[in-house]
Interface confidence: medium
């Protein structure tokens, strides 16, 4: 699947319900500039943070030219959900759509976009809009990847040994240390698709007094440091 094109700007804004909103939709100026390009870009990979609101858009076809809009939603382990709208009779029809968080943005005769409010881990999947017009069918698909921010903790568990954990992240976080030590990393996979990464490091060199755990993740990076004490130190914890 193609990566998001730079012309499809990812807009993030704070709304008064305190959830960030993400959209790959374009304004009218962008529609005219990118019309042919967007129709060619059939599929877009789109990482979206859990608990935000997401808006997925159909191809930029004027609604006056529309006959039918269909959204197909394929989520892991569920039957395909279809939401359709027929302009002439102003009818909508849904099949196998049980998740009430996935809805039309407004009335489909006014806005063909689909919204997820809020995004949950179960919304990982493929979303496709098909617009039927007198000129043919136009498609736009999204491979939606739900990102979950891991909870990061750092603590000393034995003499000159520290443990850094990135708990329940999606995808798995990467852990690095400054300075480098003698490290072992384990990953624990959870049924909901999240991964806990645990890195345990030991420093023999006694002139190392402070160590930093750096956690890299698609939702953002986080660094925590700890002083290596002769006895186990206080536990540090942070969200990315």
């Amino acid at each position: 699947a193609a990566q998001p094109n730079n012309s499809l700007m990812l807009q993030t804004s704070k709304e008064n319900h305190a959830l960030a909103s993400s959209s790959l939709c374009m304004d009218e100026k962008q529609i005219t500039q990118n019309y042919s390009k967007v129709l060619a870009e059939v599929n877009t990979s789109w990482p979206v943070k859990m608990a935000t609101n997401a808006v997925l858009c159909c191809p930029p076809i004027a609604l006056r030219n529309l006959i039918i809009i269909t959204w197909e939603i394929i989520l892991r382990g569920q039957p395909s959900c279809t939401k359709a709208y027929r302009k002439e009779t102003n009818e909508t029809k849904e099949t196998n759509c049980t998740d009430e968080r996935i809805t039309w943005v407004s009335r489909p005769d006014q806005n063909s976009d689909l919204q997820i409010r809020p995004v949950a881990i179960t919304h990982d999947g493929y979303y496709r809009c098909i617009m039927v017009t007198p000129d043919g069918n136009f498609h736009r698909g999204y491979h939606l990847q739900v990102l979950v921010t891991p909870e990061v903790t750092l603590f000393q568990n034995r003499n000159r040994t520290a443990v850094c954990k990135a708990v329940a992240g999606k995808p798995a976080a990467q852990i690095s240390w400054i300075p480098e030590g003698d490290c072992a990393t384990k990953q624990e996979y959870w049924s909901n698709g999240t991964v806990t990464v645990k890195s345990t490091c030991h420093w023999e060199v006694h002139n190392v007094s402070t160590v930093t755990c750096h956690v890299s993740h698609l939702t953002g990076n986080k660094s925590l440091y700890i002083e290596l004490l002769p006895v186990p130190g206080a536990k540090k914890s942070a969200k990315l």
Epitope: I68, T70, A84, E88, T89, K93, E94, T95, I130, V132
Partner: antibody
Framework: EVQLQQSGAEFVRPGASVKLSCTTS????????IHWVKQRPEQGLEWIGR????????KYAPKFQDKATITADTSSNTAYLQLSRLTSEDTAVYYC???????????????WGQGTSVTVSS | DVQITQSPSYLAASPGETITINCRAS??????LAWYQEKPGKTNKLLIY???TLQSGIPSRFSGSGSVTDFTLTISSLEPEDFAMYYC?????????FGGGTKLEIK
């Protein structure tokens, strides 16, 4: 194979009600729409209404709004037409038919039942 | 409601001939007109939808044309099994409405 099997002929008294059934096979009714059409003896076809079995939403022709009630049971793949306060004007053959719901093109009624004859007589 | 006027109401023809049946809508129905065949003892058959699209399994001697308000069903090289009742029907808006029907009989 797509089939719509309708219930048998009905002979009813004026003022009574009758409930006709349309059991489908070869497709899931919740994916489509089921329509009902009336045909009086030696006359043409009249559209009564339709149901979206997935959610129970119905639409009726104005003249049948107070006469007909369309329901569906997705577990048995069956649609129903209930006719109330029957008069001789309701003597007719009643057909159920399928309209494809979620397809790229909206079709009309692509499969029909064999019809149920309703005779209203005292 | 959209009124559908179908003509003629009766038509006599011989096998091998070509016939046309017309339907006129009281207002625009775009291309959303269907044609059906009704025969005693058989379930009604969809012949044409969207004005001109032949339904799967229907012989190519059946064809439909027209849009907006005026539509035509043409049956070329009539076969004995084509003698039946024919109805047009609009499905552009509710309530759906049918034409009065055309009875095609053998001359």
């Amino acid at each position: 194979e797509v089939q719509l099997q309708q219930s048998g002929a009905e002979f009813v008294r004026p003022g009574a009600s009758v409930k006709l059934s349309c059991t489908t096979s070869g497709f899931y009714i919740k994916d489509d729409y089921i329509h009902w059409v009336k045909q009086r003896p030696e006359q043409g076809l009249e559209w009564i209404g339709r149901i979206d079995p997935a959610n129970g939403n119905t639409k009726y022709a104005p003249k049948f709004q107070d006469k007909a009630t369309i329901t569906a049971d997705t577990s048995s793949n069956t649609a129903y037409l209930q006719l109330s306060r029957l008069t001789s004007e309701d003597t007719a053959v009643y057909y159920c038919a399928r309209q494809l719901g979620l397809r790229r093109t909206w079709y009309s009624l692509d499969y029909w039942g064999q019809g149920t004859s309703v005779t209203v007589s005292s | 409601d959209v009124q559908i006027t179908q003509s003629p109401s009766y038509l006599a023809a011989s096998p091998g001939e070509t016939i046309t049946i017309n339907c006129r809508a009281s207002k625009s129905i775009s291309k959303y007109l269907a044609w059906y065949q009704e025969k005693p003892g058989k379930t009604n058959k969809l012949l044409i939808y969207s004005g001109s699209t032949l339904q799967s399994g229907i012989p190519s001697r059946f064809s439909g044309s027209g849009s907006v308000t005026d539509f035509t069903l043409t049956i070329s090289s009539l076969e004995p099994e084509d003698f039946a009742m024919y109805y047009c029907q609009q499905y552009n808006e509710y309530p759906w409405t049918f034409g009065g029907g055309t009875k095609l009989e053998i001359k």
